[in-house]
């Protein structure tokens, strides 16, 4: 009876202190405020460990809350010019560098680069272009950045364990957000409900990019923002599978993104989002 | 449905050794991050520790930090807790529970959005 | 880091409004969360992301946070809500927190 997947036991072996943020704002919640302009800002998500959009109204909010991502960035993850180490014993890779390869249910037959765990290199695969899992990167460069050790086990990319010059401890640290947790769907998914200025009481859902799921909320009839779909499943086309179903002052568009423009994040959400 | 279903609990000896396991059913087990609360008897709930979706990573509450190891069998969609070098302070019902998806990431969510039923840990001589 | 308190108990009458205090140091910066226990059951969420109820969680129970204060409140208190809530949130490496739980007694 095996106490975990046995390819993963040297990294369960140690524990790993959580995430250290730069500035204890940015663990904050995205606060809108109760002001109604609706301006895009940028707050870095502590339990996503990326920066994201979203509006705010205009007044008061906390100060998580930045001009651009840019800005974001560089308040709330770790500068490049931080030296990154990684051991056997210590690394903190992304849970998706541990999933076996995955073409997917398509037949796009789309080359792609995935890590192998066995080898302990990024290599080239077939990818249907649809479904699949979050082992799967555009370019040899990105999986390497991500899943790849450098040599002598240092980590040559965004994601490891940073030694920490005042103690000497090892602290993961996420030094930027990769290309590869940018959200490629449509951008209002990232925003927070909007009830807006009328006084009607609509049901509505929007999708709570905290926790990835599509909730209820009440729609005043007017105003609010394009996160807001009259059902559950629009929502989730919308946010979770790549189509775009805004709600604009003209009524309902409804488009179809082309998957290629998804990229990976097609099926990163398959891996990860099953249960809503 | 989705259910939770701790195992293993039991009386043991102060200094001794314990492994809790968890049965997951009703849901896509390797996608979610796992969590181990517990309750000390007539006490408050205590988070102990959590382990990421596929186990790369865990993070442990201080006072079980080094005495205590989550694990998870992904393909038996079971978690565990090996217990070690046992005090009476651990006395308690250890639950297992579910933390919600962190949007798009392989991190844990900010709660609980389902909860075992509870398995008791006495440790006492 | 962040630790939050609750007054240990909370009396009321049924069908008077019963309010369950969180404090914590900036709590209104970051998202509460309320679980309601029964004696030997588990804990069951009744509301996330400061005042988001559940579905299948009754529209009385309402929760709201700001500065160094969250608050559970339960209108038109049943005698069904007598139980212990607890409020949760999260430090700021990611870490979930509890509160110490208030028993409710509705009188």
């Known amino acids: 009876d095996s106490e975990e997947d046995e390819e993963h036991t040297i990294i369960t072996d140690t524990e790993l202190p959580p995430l250290k943020l730069m500035h204890s704002f940015c663990a904050f919640k995205a606060d809108d405020g109760p002001c109604k302009a609706i301006m895009k800002r940028f707050f870095f998500n502590i339990f996503t460990r990326q920066c994201e959009e979203f509006i705010y109204g205009g007044c008061e909010g906390n100060q998580n809350r930045f001009e651009s991502l840019e800005e974001c960035k560089k308040m709330c993850t770790r500068d490049n010019a931080n030296r990154i180490i990684k051991t056997t014993l210590q690394q903190e890779k992304p849970d998706f560098c541990f999933l076996e390869e995955d073409p997917g249910i398509c037949r796009g037959y789309i080359t792609r680069y995935f890590y192998n765990n066995q080898t302990k290199q990024c290599e080239r695969f077939k990818y249907g272009g649809c479904l699949g899992n979050m082992n799967n990167f555009e370019t040899l460069e990105e999986c390497k950045n991500i899943c790849e050790d450098g040599p002598n086990g240092f980590q040559v990319d965004n994601y490891g364990t940073q030694l920490n010059a005042v103690n000497n401890s090892l602290t993961p640290q996420s030094t930027k957000v990769p290309s590869l947790f940018e959200f490629h769907g449509p951008s209002w998914c990232l925003t927070p409900a909007d009830r807006g200025l009328c006084r009607a009481n609509e049901n509505r859902f929007y999708y709570n990019s905290v926790i990835g799921k599509c909730r209820p909320f009440k729609y005043s009839g007017c105003g609010g923002n394009e996160n807001n779909f009259t059902s559950k499943q629009e929502c989730l086309r919308a946010c979770k599978k790549g189509f775009i179903q805004r709600i604009s002052k003209g009524g309902l568009i409804k488009t179809k993104r082309k998957r290629k423009k998804q990229r990976v994040k097609i099926a990163y959400e398959e891996i990860f989002v099953k249960n809503m | 449905q989705v259910q939770l279903v701790e195992s293993g609990g039991g009386l043991v000896q102060p200094g001794g050794s314990l492994r809790l396991s968890c049965a997951a059913s009703?849901?896509?087990?390797?996608?979610?991050?796992m969590t181990w609360v517990r309750q000390a008897p007539g006490k408050g709930l205590e988070w102990v520790s959590v382990?990421?979706?596929?186990?790369?990573?865990?993070y442990y509450a201080d006072s079980v930090k080094g005495r205590f190891t989550i694990s998870r069998d992904n393909s038996k969609n079971t978690l565990y807790l090996q217990m070690n070098s046992l005090r009476a302070e651990d006395t308690a019902v250890y639950y297992c529970?579910?933390?919600?998806?962190?949007?798009?990431?392989?991190?844990?969510?900010?709660?609980?959005?389902?909860w075992g039923q509870g398995t008791l840990v006495t440790v006492s001589s | 880091d962040i630790e939050l308190t609750q007054p240990p108990s909370v009396s009321v009458a049924p069908g008077q409004t019963a309010r369950i205090s969180c404090s914590g140091d900036n709590i209104g910066s970051y998202y509460a969360y309320w679980y309601q226990q029964k004696p030997g059951q588990a804990p069951v969420l009744v509301i996330y992301?400061?005042?988001n109820r559940p579905s299948g969680i009754p529209e009385r129970f309402s929760g709201s946070n700001s500065g160094n204060t969250a608050t559970l409140t339960i209108s038109g208190t049943q005698a069904e809500d007598e139980a212990d809530y607890y409020c949760q949130s999260y430090d700021s490496t990611g870490l979930l927190v509890f509160g110490g739980g208030t028993k409710l007694t509705v009188l």
């Open positions: 529970a579910r933390p919600t998806k962190a949007g798009r990431t392989w991190w844990w969510g900010p709660y609980m959005d389902v």
């Open positions: 992301d400061d005042s």
């Open positions: 382990i990421s979706s596929v186990g790369s990573n865990t």
């Open positions: 009703g849901f896509t087990f390797s996608n979610y991050a």
